[in-house]
Interface confidence: low
Amino acid sequence: QPPPPPDATCHQVRSFFQRLQPGLKWVPETPVPGSDLQVCLPKGPTCCSRKMEEKYQLTARLNMEQLLQSASMELKFLIIQNAAVFQEAFEIVVRHAKNYTNAMFKNNYPSLTPQAFEFVGEFFTDVSLYILGSDINVDDMVNELFDSLFPVIYTQMMNPGLPESVLDINECLRGARRDLKVFGSFPKLIMTQVSKSLQVTRIFLQALNLGIEVINTTDHLKFSKDCGRMLTRMWYCSYCQGLMMVKPCGGYCNVVMQGCMAGVVEIDKYWREYILSLEELVNGMYRIYDMENVLLGLFSTIHDSIQYVQKNGGKLTTTIGKLCAHSQQRQYR
Amino acid sequence: SAYYPEDLFIDKKILKVAHVEHEETLSSRRRELIQKLKSFINFYSALPGYICSHSPVAENDTLCWNGQELVERYSQKAARNGMKNQFNLHELKMKGPEPVVSQIIDKLKHINQLLRTMSVPKGKVLDKSLDEEGLESGDCGDDEDECIGSSGDGMVKVKNQLRFLAELAYDLDVDDAPGNKQHGNQKDNEITTSHS
């Protein structure tokens, strides 16, 4: 394509440039040598100035950012929406699990309420916090639940004659609970189930949130000056020759994009691995690795553990009577 | 929440769990998400091609711009000349990713490691320790309804886990969402730069 003749005007370039930037003073009236141009290197007179070139570079980089954002829009929507859905759904599961457990106490062990409600509430609050990333130890949570429940079970059901809320004996009972394994292997069972299912749930949510962070990072990438120059040559340098209608060659576009996206494309390997690893995790999220299954069945396991205590009640009362005698004597004096 | 009716599924007098007809379990929602995510598995490698197909590129035109001049669309010059005597594309690639990209790659590596560590090995759903301690009370067979509790008095069965009810807060069928899925090989009606 021959360059415009020296007597030609830059009218069309002016009207096109006006769309990008108010300030026609930047556009030459007639083609100029353009010796100061750094990107749209002219083969003859040109309708572009250095200022126009800078504006084109800025626009090209902005265009690129917008194209990138529109490319990731659906993916971003998918992950953000699902992260929100799962977070709320998990909270709902926890709420229902708490309500099931409270209902079980109310219907089967009314004498243990309202203290049991308090301990159950604390336990499930910790469960929620753990899922959201709090630095809480699951074994400690389960131990705390049974440590708190046992003194109430002992003083309300097994030995109702004792004065209520005896701090000394409560401390002794909490210790005895672990030493004597008063709930059998149920606390250990609950620990294993709860910790496995909650760990998986927590990492699942963390992974979704990281997915959002990955998209956000690439969405807001600032492209390099070199990339801006390449994009300008591809999208806008034709304007300097008055070629408003021509479009970049397909192969040329691919070469430029690969250059601009070289850094971003490096994410690809890890992104693929991320999706496949997440799939593997999800495939394993059932039975004891599914918090929905575990937490909603928890009230049943707690019920079984209390029945276990009741079954061994006589033997336990005698042993604890001896073990915590010192505390009781002090209390009666 | 709009997910579930606020009233509990429990009739407190007899501790009966209402059987909500099957809508959608959390696990099916998870699997659905993974399927949709897998359609984006090539997202990053396909980006350059996707962006070219969604920006003005000569498709049906005889002539196209190669960065320096108008050339025949299928000529050797179509991809080559535009890059000559300008800045080295190889150099641009050699610079390596931006610090933010390197950071996000590190985070991805970390989460991938965690995900692999947490993934349940195939065929080993229950730990040996649990088998030994006996899981009978809470673990019902796959084919039957999932049990909550043993058959003791006052215990109940909840049919096939907690349900997603119809009142889901968001319609997550993303098929109608903006954008297109398989970014790698989609060609949009290209935007012909004109003069409107």
Epitope: C10, H11, R19, G242, L243, M245 | I191, T192, T193, H195
Partner: antibody
Framework: QVQLVQSGAEVKKPGASVKVSCKAS????????ISWVRQAPGQRLEWMGW????????KYSQKFQGRVTITRDTSASTAYMELSSLRSEDTAVYYC?????WGQGTL | EIVLTQSPLSLPVTPGEPASISCRSS???????????LDWYLQKPGQSPQILIY???HRASGVPDRFSGSASGTDFTLKISRVEAEDVGVYYC?????????FGGGTK
């Protein structure tokens, strides 16, 4: 798929104003200008004006200067054309056009 | 402003036959870059105009190759090598050299 979707038909009394919207999708809205063209029954197409979707700059046809206002909302990828002091001869189908794509028209 | 005069006003054609529409400009539409800033549009019944040819002779994406445009000074011609039933409508020429953009009167 590039699409320009315009608002529905309007009936106005002489002297009133009308505002027509044009929602763009399928391309980067701020990258191109949007023209407004009208077509009165049995008349040729008539260019009214243009807006730079990127910076909001406008250019109007002398014929409509003072009566037409073209605006845009980048967050909604939408351009608007408001025509005031309506007369009976303003009865027409109004089109928005960007690049080589046209809206479906608003009567 | 630039005035565009189209002829004929109406053009009955049998499918399979060629057709030719003329558009004369009141002044040159030749830009210094060598392109003629004239476009051809087709408006099918009940539809919006759609681009056929831009810059005098460049066929737009997706336009069948039976459509072609040519220029000779201020005279522009749109040719259809073999008319098909779906080509029914009003054909307009439009100049994009300067504002206001102007259109021809149309050929049915």
């Amino acid at each position: 798929q590039v699409q320009l979707v315009q608002s529905g038909a309007e009936v106005k009394k002489p002297g009133a104003s009308v505002k027509v919207s044009c929602k763009a999708s399928g391309y980067t809205f701020t990258s191109y200008g949007i023209s407004w063209v009208r077509q009165a029954p049995g008349q040729r197409l008539e260019w009214m004006g243009w807006i730079n979707a990127g910076n909001g700059n406008t250019k109007y046809s002398q014929k409509f200067q003072g009566r037409v206002t073209i605006t845009r909302d980048t967050s909604a990828s939408t351009a608007y054309m408001e025509l005031s002091s309506l007369r009976s001869e303003d009865t027409a189908v109004y089109y928005c056009a960007t690049v080589v794509y046209w809206g479906q028209g608003t009567l | 402003e630039i005035v565009l005069t189209q002829s004929p006003l109406s053009l009955p054609v049998t499918p399979g036959e060629p057709a030719s529409i003329s558009c004369r400009s009141s002044q040159s539409l030749l830009h210094s870059n060598g392109y003629n800033y004239l476009d051809w549009y087709l408006q099918k019944p009940g539809q919006s105009p759609q681009i056929l040819i831009y810059l005098g002779s460049h066929r737009a994406s997706g336009v069948p190759d039976r459509f072609s445009g040519s220029a000779s000074g201020t005279d522009f011609t749109l040719k259809i090598s073999r008319v098909e039933a779906e080509d029914v409508g009003v054909y307009y020429c439009m100049q994009a050299l300067q504002t206001p953009l102007t259109f021809g009167g149309g050929t049915k």
